[in-house]
Amino acid sequence: LSLEAPTVGKGQAPGIEETDGELTAAPTPEQPERGVHFVTTAPTLKLLNHHPLLEEFLQEGLEKGDEELRPALPFQPDPPAPFTPSPLPRLANQDSRPVFTSPTPAMAAVPTQPQSKEGPWSPESESPMLRITAPLPPGPSMAVPTLGPGEIASTTPPSRAWTPTQEGPGDMGRPWVAEVVSQGAGIGIQGTITSSTASGDDEETTTTTTIITTTITTVQTPGPCSWNFSGPEGSLDSPTDLSSPTDVGLDCFFYISVYPGYGVEIKVQNISLREGETVTVEGLGGPDPLPLANQSFLLRGQVIRSPTHQAALRFQSLPPPAGPGTFHFHYQAYLLSCHFPRRPAYGDVTVTSLHPGGSARFHCATGYQLKGARHLTCLNATQPFWDSKEPVCIAACGGVIRNATTGRIVSPGFPGNYSNNLTCHWLLEAPEGQRLHLHFEKVSLAEDDDRLIIRNGDNVEAPPVYDSYEVEYLPIEGLLSSGKHFFVELSTDSSGAAAGMALRYEAFQQGHCYEPFVKYGNFSSSTPTYPVGTTVEFSCDPGYTLEQGSIIIECVDPHDPQWNETEPACRAV
């Protein structure tokens, strides 16, 4: 038996209510309101991890402030995890890093001259200045130290909630410092740091702070060089004036570590390499190093994004007199996000934000029920993740639909085939004082003992108004309940399968006709609730023509209101 009715409905079924567990992030500083804007970079190359940047996904922080859309900074955040840059060599002082939670537009600049011969590590250390060059307001959840005028960040952290615990050697008291470990020559690096304090009348005070950075200088042959960066942003510049032997080239490493939950974005400001020189970029911090780019892709303006909170850049140059070439890259941290949740088949998903704290809400098309969480929250982590698996929309095997006003019931698997050995019961209950009209969108049962019964009542013993075993054809006009219930049964045997059924229902008031429906068309009605005397005129969408039934129907018979003709169907021309 394979019978198909001419129309398909589009009503809304009442959903299965589920409670949403809301996750709340820790309070964070206010974030300026802003709209969505795209940043694209030139040239545009269709490469792995080279995307236009959607810096804000939707307007976070609008109206309510949306604290939950911002990543929370723990009061004692863990330092970024140690590097495991296999196969690249492990560097010193990577076990303890200052932490931050938000990128800022601070810029790292060119090296400066050493200012002091004194430092905490060795008498021979050279200490370039790390100067603050621009005032910057803290971003959301930004761990920025607030220093008063004249204060200097020292190796002993001030007692503030944001201060990370020092677990290893290094300048943990100097937040956001680009640390330089130069084996071969002293390299000065100027970075930036800002602090801002607000007085009672909300005036902003900008403070310039001088921070001493120590550089270890050792002479080593053949002259590898490496730098570690742990700030939210900085500059990666090709080494110059290295006092390395003249007969070897350079093999330099730039390691960048940002706060977990952020990725590293590297922008090529300038690059001019000589033939044979290589620059490679890898994402670290995952199970395996992730190759991101090499010199062939590193064109000016290109942006490389590591989806992990650690990255490494390796520069291998030629020996003099040919080399080395030059480059100037700028890196900054960017907030990692959850992947866009998969839209369920026969459903949809609405996302407020893909960043930690953002949420995704799922709902199903009429006739389908959600299996799984209706509401997911993006959680902050080294790689942010949704707090539950994406749900799926399933055509449930039965159920109770109370206050059924308009909607659909479909067999499990629809529009795919149903399973064997099913017995599904649906109870439809119209609102008090109303009856139900049931329309057959599709009924396709296997030729064996599969069976669909629709009963005029609320139980398995109520007399049927449709039984696929006994009825010769599907009624185009559908079925009417005498009361407020329909009881639908689908049973399948152990062999054979077909698409099953899709039934559309609508409730209507006593003394009225049910609301008409025509797929691929429209209708106009003389009155909105279809009492006796109402006339309805049908029309079809472009490319379709009216067939069977009548263009105009009327609700007749005050004792038992019904349409005087069947609804027409719109067929493709």
Epitope: V465, Y469, E470, V471, P475, L479, S482
Partner: nanobody
Framework: DVQLVESGGGSVQAGGSLRVSCAVS????????MGWFRQAPGKEREGVAA????????YYVDSVKGRFTISLDSTKNTLYLQMNDLKPEDTGTYYC?????????????????WGQGTQVTVSS
């Protein structure tokens, strides 16, 4: 041509029993509904019982549940209604019907073919 012919009606005392029959000819379908209806003088016709030719499922109006039994002998192509514990309100003309349309099986909707009826009288 489908024909339905009822027989077995008559008069009976309240509490008595009666069996009415309906011989079906020309109806070759293995599926569809067969039903019994009755009409008392001055009243509308009402469904009494129905049976599915393929499923054998049986349905009864509430007023006769436990007293009447519908059955179908497919070999003889005959429909029966066994009536026990008859009451005066069971009096009326009993009609046999057959059909395979959708609709409440205890209403006339599904039925296309009808017999002429047989009279049943229950006196107190």
């Amino acid at each position: 041509d489908v024909q339905l012919v009822e027989s077995g009606g008559g008069s009976v005392q309240a509490g008595g029993s009666l069996r009415v029959s309906c011989a079906v000819s020309g109806y070759t379908k293995s599926s569809g509904w067969m039903g019994w209806f009755r009409q008392a003088p001055g009243k509308e016709r009402e469904g009494v019982a129905a049976i599915g030719r393929r499923s054998g499922d049986r349905y009864y109006v509430d007023s006769v549940k436990g007293r009447f039994t519908i059955s179908l002998d497919s070999t003889k192509n005959t429909l029966y209604l066994q009536m026990n514990d008859l009451k005066p309100e069971d009096t009326g003309t009993y009609y046999c019907a057959a059909g395979g349309r959708a609709g409440n099986v205890l209403t006339s909707q599904p039925y296309r073919y009808w017999g002429q009826g047989t009279q049943v009288t229950v006196s107190s």
